[in-house]
């Protein structure tokens, strides 16, 4: 089920997700100048059972001034310096990726994507903070925010994140253990939806993975 | 909480135009397509297109080219869609919405009359 | 154009059955289709994306299934606030179309 609103907002902050579950949408956006494909995947979603998820559709895009162009093809390198990233961008993965069942991996650039990724999240994801470059992080608690149902209405959790304008960058998900550490969670925010298993794979993706784009805008 | 809101009834004359409007909240409105549906009693629900704020892009159903022309108005975040050279044919509903994640707008009824 | 048909323009049910709705494409779509439920006097509200994805706030209740050209929307335990009509959409492609509505009656 979609989460009605978008992860919290935290000054000086910016969230993704290690794998995405299945159920969430990515839009198909183009950049500046370029439009989706008439009759192009409007987004691609994320889909599959418990042992296999990958992303259905791709996303296509045309220059607006010549609309014949549908070409699919992965960006050449000064294409790619166009998307927000971050030191950690390396290597995409492949789109298929079933280390944390029910999931996908974050999804390969497309020609001519927009510098943002807009993503809608479904009941249960987990979205992890970090602080923007030039802000160091001040820990109450975990950096991270879980989309919950309660009383039929979507919320996220707030996560416990204070960044503080030190010239320091802090490593990702964070570089202090209690926030790596599921019995650091208060009890008010454990979520029934997201088990400590998850948050332990999902802890051990975030050391390891080789994806990191961040976005700022999600809805 | 994404919202469309349109605005008020319209009754005009056949022959005559009219420019029926679409404000939108709680998004990022020149992310996201937004489309216009009309619906008549008996003839179900028909998709007359769709335009991208952020670029001014359009698809329209062939249908309704030379009919509908959609525009929007970006510091407003405001779609507009102009019907042109109105018959009793044109007397509907019409809808806005965004089209991904899907979110309508309450409708504007318009009444083509002599 | 796509045509996406309802075969059945109206169902009676009653509060507590199961009932399916369904609808036929004329040609593969894959699984771009949306369901909405529109009440009297309403605007349709979205249900289902994606063929059987259920939008924010849909009862569970609420089940979409299909793929290519057979899609079905599945009402379990049905309420008494579910007096609609339903229309089927088509995304796949342009222009996008939909269904002719079933109307759901409750006896």
């Known amino acids: 089920e979609l989460c009605d609103d978008d992860p919290p907002e935290i000054p000086h902050a910016t969230f993704k997700a290690m794998a995405y579950k299945e159920g969430t949408m990515l839009n198909c956006e183009c950049k500046r100048g370029f439009r989706r494909i008439k009759s192009g995947s409007l987004y691609m979603l994320c889909t599959g059972n418990s042992s296999h998820s990958s992303w259905d559709n791709q996303c296509q895009c045309t220059s607006s001034a010549t609309r014949n162009t549908t070409k699919q093809v992965t960006p050449q390198p000064e294409e790619q310096k166009e998307r927000k990233t971050t030191e950690m961008q390396s290597p995409m993965q492949p789109v298929d990726q079933a280390s944390l069942p029910g999931h996908c991996r974050e999804p390969p650039p497309w020609e001519n994507e927009a510098t943002e990724r807009i993503y809608h999240f479904v009941v249960g994801q987990m979205v992890y903070y970090q602080c923007v470059q030039g802000y160091r992080a001040l820990h109450r608690g975990p950096a991270e925010s879980v989309c919950k149902m309660t009383h039929g209405k979507t919320r996220w959790t707030q996560p416990q994140l204070i960044c503080t304008g030190e010239m320091e960058t802090s490593q990702f998900p964070g570089e202090e253990k209690p926030q790596a550490s599921p019995e650091g969670r208060p009890e008010s925010e454990t979520s029934c939806l997201v088990t400590t298993t998850d948050f332990q794979i999902q802890t051990e993706m975030a050391a390891t993975m080789e994806t990191s784009i961040f976005t700022t805008e999600y809805q | 909480q994404v919202q469309m809101q349109q605005s008020g009834a319209e009754l005009v004359r056949p022959g005559t135009s009219v420019k029926i409007s679409c404000k939108a909240s709680g998004y990022t409105f020149t992310n996201y397509w937004l489309g216009w549906v009309k619906q008549r009693p008996g003839h179900g629900l028909e998709w007359i297109g769709d335009?991208?704020?952020?670029?001014?892009?359009?698809n329209y159903n062939e249908k309704f080219k030379g009919k509908a022309t959609l525009t929007a108005d970006t510091s407003s975040s405001t779609a507009y869609m102009q019907l042109s050279s109105l018959t009793s044919e044109d007397s509907a509903v019409y809808f806005c919405?965004?089209?991904?994640?899907?979110?309508w707008g309450q409708g504007t009824t318009l009444t083509v009359s002599s | 154009d796509i045509q996406m048909t309802q075969s059945q323009k109206f169902m009676s049910t009653s509060v507590g059955d199961r009932v399916s709705v369904t609808c036929k494409a004329s040609q593969n779509v894959g699984t771009n289709v949306a369901w909405y439920q529109q009440k009297p006097g309403q605007s349709p509200k979205a249900l289902i994306y994606s063929a059987s994805y259920r939008y924010s706030g849909v009862p569970d209740r609420f089940t979409g299934s299909g793929s290519g050209t057979d899609f079905t929307l599945t009402i379990s335990n049905v309420q008494s606030e579910d007096l609609a009509e339903y229309f089927c959409q088509q995304y796949n492609s342009y222009p996008w179309t939909f269904g002719g509505g079933t109307k759901l009656e409750i006896k």
């Open positions: 335009i991208y704020p952020g670029g001014g892009y359009t």
């Open positions: 919405a965004r089209v991904t994640p899907a979110s």
